[in-house]
Interface confidence: low
Amino acid sequence: HNTTVFQGVAGQSLQVSCPYDSMKHWGRRKAWCRQLGEKGPCQRVVSTHNLWLLSFLRRWNGSTAITDDTLGGTLTITLRNLQPHDAGLYQCQSLHGSEADTLRKVLVEVLADPLDHRDAGDLWFPGESESFEDAHVEHSISRSLLEGEIPFPPTSHHHHHH
């Protein structure tokens, strides 16, 4: 999996999007987890509604929210009040039974300076990435990481590496 970098600004919200094949993942709940180390487990942060048909309802765990557009095939995670400790490697997952398929590897970076944006305050920009495999950026300030990179960067924004 490529790693997409999303950069956000400390104190602001960062939106991470994970596109997927809506037919292939039909009926599956989704989850957002944080990678613990380069080869460690992925610790669940938040998952979509227990009832798949209600996946569009936003669910929160602390400052992290998740919502799933099951028809359009886009999982959206919102990190509210982004903080430096939020930086790191995450995964969007599709759940089936006790198994989980990785939809996207995400490197979240947190930028400290609000002036270090692209331009508009509501735009997301790409950030630096960690040692990951084939990372790439997306417009919500996201970008791809490279192979072998490790996920523990700073502030982040999202914008396909803008």
Epitope: N2, A112, S144
Partner: antibody, heavy 116, light 107 residues
Framework: EVQLQESGPELVKPGASVKMSCKAS????????MHWVKQSHGKSLEWIGY????????GYNQKFKGKATLTVNKSSSTAYMELRSLTSEDSAVYYC?????????WGQGTLVTVSA | DIVMTQSPASLSVTPGDRVSLSCRAS??????LHWYQQKSHESPRLLIK???QSISGIPSRFSGSGSGSDFTLSINSVEPEDVGVYYC?????????FGGGTKLEIK
Amino acid sequence: EVQLQESGPELVKPGASVKMSCKASGYTFTDYNMHWVKQSHGKSLEWIGYIYPNNGGTGYNQKFKGKATLTVNKSSSTAYMELRSLTSEDSAVYYCARSGRGFAYWGQGTLVTVSA
Amino acid sequence: DIVMTQSPASLSVTPGDRVSLSCRASQSISDYLHWYQQKSHESPRLLIKYASQSISGIPSRFSGSGSGSDFTLSINSVEPEDVGVYYCQNGHSFPYTFGGGTKLEIK
């Protein structure tokens, strides 16, 4: 004013290691990734990797994994890059550059010469 | 890895000329493209970020355009001090990659 001050030139023997430094000032060191870039004589630029000073997280270009190791000392706002098992191919100028929207801030470069 | 190809490799221009430097990415990188100028024995200097965004302190004669995989750095009315090598950088995916550079000389 943001400044990145790199250590001086190094003349090292093949097979040896070298550790260079990049002292940052003018901003909060732990807030931005520090990147390292290689430029061989007369050649283009190669991104080596980066480190996030706040937690020591690193990311490497696969080409430089095993060759370069990035570390930081937060108390002195200094980033380090160690290169090991040096060969003539490692002779180059190495720059540190601060992250942001593009690399707006660069060190002056550290020239490493590998020669017997 | 994303390969960045710059053209021409070098060019010689007359002061006052308008110059266009090309950079092509091996795959779409949206507008995650940065331009740098490097003068002899100096560190690179950021000229343009995100394909077209200007940088404080950089003369207005430098401008950038493009999106996707094709990008252009334009210098409107070249000045003698603009000599150097110009690099484009993929800021979209890791590993970050740079073009081979375009060497600008003044006649």
